[in-house]
């Protein structure tokens, strides 16, 4: 049904889904905080730009009675009663920011005669790419995906001389939200990783992992994982490591290995980990949150959520275009906005850019160092150190398929 | 360890000047947006002003607006807020907080406008 949008008049309405099912196991109250301060600051940049006019955010809660199991798998109906709430209430915003599972916000975009922008921290997955009124303001699974396959293919690089095109993906089932679309990308056969790799195979037990750490008749020497250090220990334990085994750690919302007092344990020696750069510091530089930094990342998106409309609403109103139209929910893509830590770059689909950096711990001094950066914006890799202290031989990393020879 | 230290409270005249400071620890200062808050007594906290990690945007709340300014020094990791033409509803306790989430705190000091 056609539902009203407070969206008028000098009066700009948010609303904010807060669903009890959730990419991240979020305190909502912490999320409340960062929708007021992104209010907070948003007031402030419209009454600097000479725009007098209101803006509030409306919290939806799910009464929670059903779908209770806190993680996204009972969520999909979750974001469909909440949508049923406001409309049965009359009450919709400019904006719908909310959703972070892939199931609810892909079922919420199919069923819905989407005219307003709809702003997702998460929504990781392949089947909420390309959606035209979407937002997605944490890296979803397709950034990864083309992290990987540039990085499998480069072989230009003085510690990467080899192209790859096998891998192992471990994937057990008990990942976190993001790793399990992340993972889930890479082994759809139709994805594009799939398609840029002659073999790949997925692991989903613990001994099969652990039996191709010494397999001398693996097929690969690279093995795709998620989640951070402690998982991989949990997993690998101290158990012996052949040399030319690489294991790709993908841990993106995690920048405890940028601390200055963190020492990287032995058990991540062969070890390359993926992760985002931490905001508006420099790399290498010493901070301290008491929020786990996944948490921080998740609210944070929330946070920059509201800013992102702020800019936009900024631009609409100063160009006196209309909010409720079709323009205002198509225009939530192709641009950079002032976020809390800095510019967000969104891309032509409205998901989020960032720079990537790949890490490796030095042999000499037991610290993640940065071997390269990725930018997902323009599909490039940057190398940083040209000569890195790796475990591997010649300090270099080893060609994916042994006994392969320079190719 | 993160800590926030505050200072430059005490008795004002309806009308004058105070300066309060706050100092940072324990932590990239220059990473974070900071906030002043207060809480007047038997009231709820209210924030005051908040600004950028890099200085380039500050904010007010509308209560003291063109008589207050907020400021950083991130080479001294240091936080102020300059209270002038004081009233007597800005008797409070003012805290610096760091982040959006207000994650940390300092002691407070308290700050008495009155005749």
């Known amino acids: 049904s056609q539902v009203s949008q407070n969206c008028h008049n000098g009066s700009y309405e948010i609303s904010v889904l807060m669903m009890g099912n959730s990419a991240f196991a979020e305190p909502l109250k912490n999320l409340e905080d960062a929708v007021n301060e992104g209010l907070e600051i948003v007031r402030g940049r419209l009454q600097n730009a000479g725009l007098n006019v209101t803006v509030n955010a409306t919290f939806m809660y799910s009464d929670g009675l059903i779908h209770n199991s806190g993680d996204c798998r009972s969520s999909t109906c979750e974001g469909l009663d909440l949508l049923r709430k406001i409309s049965n209430a009359q009450r919709m915003g400019c904006v719908l920011i909310g959703p972070s599972c892939t199931y609810s916000t892909f079922q919420m975009y199919l069923d819905t005669e989407l005219s307003y922008p709809m702003i997702s921290a998460g929504s990781f997955g392949l089947s909420c790419d390309y959606k035209e009124t979407l937002t997605r303001l944490m890296s979803p699974a397709r950034k990864l995906m083309y992290f990987l396959v540039n990085f499998w293919k480069t072989n230009d690089l003085p510690f990467k001389t080899y192209s790859w095109s096998t891998s192992y993906v471990y994937k057990n089932g008990t990942e976190t939200e993001d790793c399990f679309w992340y993972l889930n990308a890479l082994e759809a056969s139709v994805s594009y990783f799939s398609h840029e790799l002659g073999f790949k195979v997925v692991l989903r037990q613990d001994k099969e992992f652990q039996d191709i750490l010494m397999d001398h008749n693996r097929k690969s020497n690279v093995i795709i994982m998620c989640g951070g250090p402690e998982f991989l220990y949990k997993l690998k334990g101290d158990r012996a490591v052949a040399e030319d085994i690489v294991i790709i750690l993908v841990d993106l919302f995690n920048d405890q290995y940028f601390e200055d007092n963190v020492t990287a344990p032995d058990y991540m020696k062969n070890v390359l980990v993926l992760t985002l750069s931490p905001g508006n510091s420099l790399l290498n530089s010493s901070f301290s949150r008491n929020l786990s930094p996944t948490k921080r990342d998740f609210a944070l998106a929330y946070l920059n959520g509201i800013l992102l409309f702020g800019h936009m609403l900024k631009i609409f109103l100063e160009n006196g275009e209309n909010i409720t139209t079709p323009k205002f929910a198509h225009a939530f893509r192709n641009l950079t906005f002032e976020g809390y830590d800095g510019p967000v770059t969104l891309d032509d689909w409205g998901d989020v850019d960032s720079t990537m950096v790949l890490l490796y711990t030095s042999v000499d001094t037991k610290k993640y160092k940065v071997l390269l950066t990725y930018d997902t914006h323009v599909n490039k890799t940057y190398p940083v150190d040209m000569s890195p202290t790796f475990t591997w031989k010649n300090s270099k990393l080893p060609n994916d398929i042994t006994g392969r020879g320079p190719q | 360890e993160v800590q926030l230290v505050e200072s430059g409270g005490g008795l004002a005249q309806p009308g004058g000047s105070l300066r309060l400071s706050c100092a940072a620890s324990?932590?990239?200062?220059?990473?974070?947006?900071m906030t002043w808050v207060r809480q007047a007594p038997g009231g709820r906290l209210e924030w005051v002003a908040k600004?950028?990690?890099?200085?380039?945007?500050?904010y007010y709340a509308d209560s003291v607006k063109g008589r207050f300014t907020i400021s950083r020094d991130n080479a001294k990791n240091s936080l102020y807020l300059q209270m002038d033409s004081l009233r007597a509803e800005d008797t409070a306790v003012y805290y610096c907080?760091?982040?959006?989430?207000?994650?940390?705190w300092g002691q407070g000091t308290l700050v008495t406008v009155s005749s």
């Open positions: 324990g932590f990239t200062f220059s990473r974070y947006w």
């Open positions: 600004i950028k990690y890099d200085g380039s945007e500050k």
């Open positions: 907080t760091r982040d959006y989430n207000k994650d940390y």
